[in-house]
Interface confidence: medium
Amino acid sequence: GITNINCSGHIWVEPATIFKMGMNISIYCQAAIKNCQPRKLHFYKNGIKERFQITRINKTTARLWYKNFLEPHASMYCTAECPKHFQETLICGKDISSGYPPDIPDEVTCVIYEYSGNMTCTWNAGKLTYIDTKYVVHVKSLETEEEQQYLTSSYINISTDSLQGGKKYLVWVQAANALGMEESKQLQIHLDDIVIPSAAVISRAETINATVPKTIIYWDSQTTIEKVSCEMRYKATTNQTWNVKEFDTNFTYVQQSEFYLEPNIKYVFQVRCQETGKRYWQPWSSLFFHKTPETVPQVTSKAFQHDTWNSGLTVASISTGHLTSDNRGDIG
């Protein structure tokens, strides 16, 4: 960056090179060029010469003042006009940053995705800080009192093999950057209570032409968890509102769920599960489409899911919005 140039003088920022966004700041430039009494000192921000708010302090020093500085990053350098020099002479440069101290991390959530071998911890970091912010995740065994710390810039995957202190832990997150440090509340977890079953997947659908035609949705999960609760939501693609069917189930074989649907309409289905009575749900499965026939029976399988229509409902696997106990708002 600009900080690597050879300087013929000195540039500094008050109150600091990293400061709170919206502050008034002063950038000072002091020339130390051999055989040069600068006629003028110039300031450049991101390569563009500044014209205003420049004050000459003495023969070698000038100050540039910014009110309410709102740019997250800027490269500053200053130059001197020396007598008998055709071009301006570079004095020095500095990268400056503005941002915010971190908010208190909240909604700390730790889950173990079945078969992953990891405990994944996420949190709501709050407002954007604009500057480099690090997070230290503290994991303390309630049985051995031993504490481990993990440094990260977003979420953290902790190998379950490294959790040797029994089943009960306290987890909390410290957020720190150049402008401040905050600490979350402590989350108490029991490893057996935070397992999210292996993803449930809808494999196919068929409509049986009985007296009242019925659609059977086939779905499954590779979970080894014995008692699982699932929700299947479905709607016509033209509708806004989801209908929800709930299941207490075990996946010893492929699940078959019956629906009585309107003929000749395209429906979309999704499923998600949790260990029965536990806190965290899987994200919703990817969208599965099935068009009910006018009369003739029809089968739709995963292999023929060519639709690219996606209303943004497919959820990333670490979306904290889907990992809370109070996350029912999206199933209306």
């Epitope: 069917k245 709930e246 299941f247 207490d248 189930t249 106990s325």
Partner: antibody, heavy 119, light 107 residues
Framework: DVQLQESGAELVKPGASVKLSCKSF????????INWMKQRPGQGLEWIGW????????NYNEKFKGKATLTADKSSSTAYMHLTSLTSEDSAVYFC????????????WGTGTTLTVSS | DIQMTQSHKFLSTSVGDRITITCKAS??????VAWYQQKSGQSPKLLIY???TRHTGVPDRFTGSGSGTDYTLTISNVQAEDLALYYC?????????FGAGTKLELK
Amino acid sequence: DVQLQESGAELVKPGASVKLSCKSFDYTFTSFDINWMKQRPGQGLEWIGWIFPGSGTTNYNEKFKGKATLTADKSSSTAYMHLTSLTSEDSAVYFCARRLTGTRYFDVWGTGTTLTVSS
Amino acid sequence: DIQMTQSHKFLSTSVGDRITITCKASQDVITAVAWYQQKSGQSPKLLIYWASTRHTGVPDRFTGSGSGTDYTLTISNVQAEDLALYYCQQHYTTPPTFGAGTKLELK
């Protein structure tokens, strides 16, 4: 002791509406679904629907959509069921019951409210 | 919706007897069956869930069993306080549905 206390008996005229209440004691109201059941003499129990007080989300039995509306007030730890366009068919004992989210069996039941619809 | 059928509306018993109450589901409910006891003028009380898991505080004379579509509640050494109405309920899927009930009465 965990308790669900329901409002007293109601006598209403056909066509009217009524709001039944279910107040919870001694547990975290926002962590459990509150379900409502209808029991008519000799006709067993019917599930009406649930509300999750934490978010206000509801799910209804198709049979009771348009008849029952479920709400909850977190500040008073009370769940409500509003029944509209009442007929003699709605005369029954109504129970609220708690279930752990993600299960469909009911571990704590309310005291029950007798609703009589008669002119 | 899944239908739950309790074939006996009434069952007669004596104190100390062993009695079995049956319940049949209209489709496989993979052991997701609960049993409730309701005494006259009272609200139902959960006895059993997942076909055989006894709820907290329920005496061990109450036993649930079954799989597929057929389920039973057995009361061994019937006590006078067990005379009540017993309902089965499938908790496999929504809407949860109940049987019509079996009334246990004295011979």
